[in-house]
């Protein structure tokens, strides 16, 4: 097993929006949880966009999933990522 | 089974503070929020705020900022809800909760019963 | 702060009958991702509250198919389709799109 590096990265969006994007990458086997959270509830599938899990060339794969925020609001949001039987929640970065 | 135990009835006088405790058991603790919930009596329900017991993060209703403090104890996967400057307002029972997947109070302690009296 | 106003404050009904309990937000509390953090509870006396729905219309789990949730935007309603006696007690909606999360003044549903 080969647990993921999780990174968060914010862009901006529409006004008084941005974007926040949270990647894994480098984990094995390719089997997953990210996804992102607000106030520690996951939010609906329909208000996430996801990326498909691929392999990265190094026997290891990589993954991300996104959603808009309103500016401001960064705290409220998490990105969860639950890999063979572990777990973190990573912040959007101010 | 989920589960969140909260402690005893306090009594404390008007200025004093008080502790609230809430016991986690049957998941792993720091994979959910804990929140705290007032409700006075005969009222409605009040939003204290949250702690993501992972990061320590805390986000708080502005109402109760600088009278409640909100932290945890990973080791004994307890969740503590500080209240200082106590007055007869802080009467009432407060309740710990837990989120799910996709709701936010799904797993509720008994509640803990607080009076301010001198 | 958004306003939470349910109506009416108190229901009487009679058992079977279908009970609607509406709930107005003060602003839209649909997130800017499309997300609506809207749900309902029931509250029974010396208890602590029950979470009956989530995210507008979605049961939760071992909650009957007589409860039913509906709305967008500010207005939202709860339906019993028939009620039991299991039912009776104080039903709150609470939204937590935005901080601070805010729940309804509560409607009391009672025997007539």
């Known amino acids: 097993t080969v647990p993921p590096m999780v990174n968060v990265t914010r862009s901006e969006a529409s006004e008084g929006n941005i974007t926040v994007t949270c990647r894994a990458s480098g984990f094995y086997p390719w089997n997953i949880t990210l996804s992102w959270r607000q106030d520690g509830v996951s939010l609906s599938h329909d208000t996430q966009q996801w990326g498909d899990v691929l392999p990265d060339g190094n026997g290891t794969y990589q993954t991300w999933v996104a959603t808009r925020i309103c500016q401001g609001e960064e705290q409220r949001f998490t990105c969860y990522m639950e890999h063979s039987g572990n777990h973190s929640t990573h912040p959007v970065p101010s | 089974e989920i589960q969140l135990q909260q402690s005893g009835p306090e009594l404390v006088k008007p200025g004093a503070s008080v502790k609230v405790s809430c016991t986690a058991s049957g998941y792993a603790f720091t994979k959910y929020n804990i929140y705290w919930v007032k409700q006075s009596h005969g009222k409605s329900l009040e939003w204290i705020g949250y702690?993501?017991?992972?990061?320590?993060?805390?986000i708080s209703n502005q109402k109760f900022t600088g009278r409640a403090t909100l932290t945890v104890d990973k080791s004994s996967s307890t969740a503590y809800l500080h209240l200082n400057s106590l007055t007869s307002e802080d009467s009432a029972v407060y309740y710990c909760a837990r989120p799910g997947s996709y709701w936010y109070f799904g797993v509720w302690g008994a509640g803990t019963t607080v009076t301010v009296s001198s | 702060d958004i306003l939470m106003t349910q109506t009416p404050l108190s229901l009487p009904v009679s058992l079977g009958d279908q009970a609607s309990i509406s709930c107005r937000s003060s602003q839209s509390i649909v997130y800017t991702n499309g997300n609506t953090n809207l749900e309902w509870y029931l509250q029974k006396p010396g208890q602590s509250p029950k979470l009956l729905i989530y995210?507008?219309?979605n049961r939760f789990s071992g909650v009957p198919d007589r409860f039913s949730g509906s709305g967008s935007g500010t207005d939202f309603t709860l339906k019993i389709s028939r009620v039991e006696a299991e039912d009776l007690g104080v039903y709150y909606c609470f939204q937590a799109s935005y901080v601070p999360f805010t729940f309804g003044s509560g409607t009391k549903v009672e025997i007539k």
């Open positions: 702690i993501d017991p992972y990061t320590g993060g805390t």
């Open positions: 995210k507008v219309s």
